[in-house]
Interface confidence: low
């Protein structure tokens, strides 16, 4: 007998062909031999069956040889085997509907766990591949977990669910709710105002919070509360801000903060945490900020930088036209007795220049 | 609809101690800074106390510091508010409030629990 | 601690009157203020936020303004429910602070 697979919620059409192209009597049945529809005279009639109301036939394609029965709105109880009788024929269908739904709410935190779970006829021995929208595949029975999920796993999985040869294919739409990036570094020469952007990787109708922006800065013994504030509706509403740096928050998604300038107290890490409502757990991102001064006092000429920078970015100063050049993998470089013009400062990364700063030297008379 | 219940309340003798408790209902209690607020008897508002939503800051107004210590369990939705060392001008009708979730005010209040510290 | 000085502390009105009550903060709070209703044997109430912001619910004809030290909290027109107490609270630094409060009685 020939098998089809189901899913819940769909439409499935078990067809049905008789030898001669016309218009005849026919008859469906379930494995009980309770009539669900068939042809009387002209008119498609229907039996006692629970199927009754969401059984329907094509009759535009009687005249062709085609009974096919179509079943809305597939429940997994309508799994059975469906005969279709025609010219003393009887023709055995096996109807197999599976259904896969996530065990949680579908809006999932970065590092929760995913649970799907297929529904199943008795009797079948279905088996599941998942795949998600980075290309990861995942294997498993009746149920399938993903113990931790990471931004890239946004998006749609395709699970496609086997059972005697035959597949039948469910997408699941997750969202992980994440910040786009998880660490991001700002550059800035002292003095200069500061941008921090946290987007984020989702969107939600309704987004509310609250967070708070940590920061320990390279100099201070311990890290401190920056800000703090709360989302509603996508709207932002500062609660606290720190007096010293005085940072201003945009009112809109994405999160925006402001640091008025960048001095070398502030350079060091952040982290933006945020805790949305009915979500347990919350949402990270870390940011850096390196600082970098350059300046001249009697007969030195130095450039330093504050901030989390990796032991391999270098730091330069160098005579604007001229060879003259002093680099060191270290946070400070100087140069004594400057030649007059036009300095740099550069901190680079492998030859990509990350921060700049020019000081002009005066000749000393 | 959000709800704050205070408990813990009653006649305690100077220089004892008494714990209260805030339950908190109707809104997700690890989201929000709780405050406690008092008022003695015909006298005006006095703010005590307020621990961030994660328990990682404290503040305290002076009259209470070295005294007081506030508290939650998340896990219970409850706040605490720990009183040592008690004096009779701690007398008063102690409300837990908490913030709104647009602005600063405290728009959220118990119904407030009576502290009488008398011999 | 700041100290909020609020004044004057009880004031007499009738019904239809437009009513005055001022705040002074001992140091800037730029906007940071709240303004409180409480009536007998309940809890206050939240009528403005950050000064001049009318919290969701609350009658429009309460009104408040003032930024840095001087703020002003401001019955239109009284009505038989606004007979309660009046509470300014400073909400820029910890320890918040309490006005001494304000008793709106009916003359």
């Known amino acids: 007998k020939k098998v089809v697979l189901g899913k819940k919620g769909d439409t499935v059409e078990l067809t049905c062909n008789a030898s001669q192209k016309k218009n005849t009597q026919f008859h469906w049945k379930n494995s009980n031999q309770i009539k669900i529809l068939g042809i009387q005279g002209l008119f498609l009639t229907k039996g006692p069956s629970k199927l009754s109301d969401r059984a329907d036939s094509r009759k535009s394609l009687w005249d062709q040889g085609c009974f096919s029965m179509i079943i809305k709105n597939l429940k997994i109880e309508d799994s059975d085997t469906y005969i279709c009788e025609v010219e003393n024929k009887k023709e055995e269908v096996e109807l197999l509907v599976f259904g896969l739904t996530a065990n949680s709410d579908t809006h999932l935190l970065e590092g929760q766990s995913l649970t799907l779970t297929l529904e199943s006829p008795p009797g079948s021995s279905p088996s599941v591949k998942c795949r998600s929208p980075g290309g990861k595949n995942i294997q498993g029975g009746r149920t399938i977990s993903v113990p931790q999920l990471e931004r890239q796993d946004s998006g749609t999985w395709t699970c496609t669910v086997s059972q005697d040869q035959k597949t039948v294919e469910f997408k699941i739409d997750i969202v992980v709710l994440a910040f786009q990036k998880a660490s991001s570094t700002v550059y800035k020469k002292e003095g200069e105002q500061v941008e921090f952007s946290f987007p984020l990787a989702f969107t939600l109708e309704k987004l509310t919070g609250s967070g708070e922006l940590w920061w320990q800065a390279e100099r201070a013994s311990s890290s401190k509360s920056w800000i703090t504030f709360d989302l509603k509706n996508k709207e932002v509403s500062v609660k606290r801000v720190t007096q010293d740096p005085k940072l201003q928050m945009g009112k809109k998604l994405p999160l925006h903060l402001t640091l008025p300038q960048a001095l070398p107290q502030y350079a060091g890490s952040g982290n933006l945490t945020l805790a949305l409502e009915a979500k347990t757990g919350k949402l990270h991102q870390e940011v850096n900020l390196v600082v970098m001064r350059a300046t001249q006092f009697q007969e030195n000429l130095t450039c330093e930088v504050w901030g989390p920078t990796s032991p391999k970015l270098t730091l330069s100063l160098k005579l604007e036209n001229k060879g003259a050049t002093v680099s060191k993998q270290a946070k400070a470089v100087w140069v004594l007795n400057p030649e007059a013009g036009m300095w740099q400062c550069l901190l680079s990364d492998s030859g990509q220049v990350l921060l700049e700063s020019n000081i002009k030297v005066v000749p000393t008379w | 609809q959000v709800q704050l219940v205070e408990s813990g309340g009653g006649v305690v003798q100077p220089g004892r101690s008494l714990r209260l408790s805030c339950t908190a209902s109707?809104?997700?209690?690890?989201?929000?800074?709780i405050h406690w607020v008092r008022q003695a008897p015909g006298k005006g508002l006095e703010w005590v106390t307020i621990?961030?939503?994660?328990?990682?800051?404290?503040y305290y107004a002076d009259s209470v510091k070295g005294r007081f210590a506030i508290s939650r369990d998340n896990s219970k939705n409850t706040l605490y508010l720990q009183m040592n060392s008690l004096r009779a001008e701690d007398t008063a009708v102690y409300y837990c409030?908490?913030?709104?979730?647009?602005?600063?005010?405290?728009?959220?209040w118990g119904q407030g629990t009576l502290v009488t510290v008398s011999s | 601690a700041i100290q909020m000085t609020q004044s004057p502390s009880s004031l007499s009105a009738s019904v239809g009157d437009r009513v005055t009550i001022t705040c002074r903060a001992s140091?800037?709070?730029?906007?940071?203020l709240g303004w409180y209703q409480q009536k007998p044997g309940k809890a206050p109430n939240l009528l403005i936020y950050?000064?001049?912001n009318l919290q969701s619910g609350v009658p429009s004809r309460f009104s408040g303004s003032g930024s840095g030290t001087d703020f002003t909290l401001t019955i239109s027109s009284l009505q038989p429910e606004d007979f309660a107490t009046y509470y300014c609270?400073?909400?820029?630094?910890?320890?918040?602070?309490f006005g001494q409060g304000t008793k709106v009685e009916i003359k």
């Open positions: 950050a000064a001049s």
């Open positions: 621990i961030w939503y994660d328990g990682s800051k404290k």
């Open positions: 609270l400073q909400d820029s630094n910890y320890p918040r602070t």
């Open positions: 409030a908490r913030e709104d979730d647009w602005n600063d005010g405290l728009a959220y």
């Open positions: 140091q800037d709070i730029r906007n940071d």
């Open positions: 109707g809104f997700n209690f690890i989201n929000y800074g």
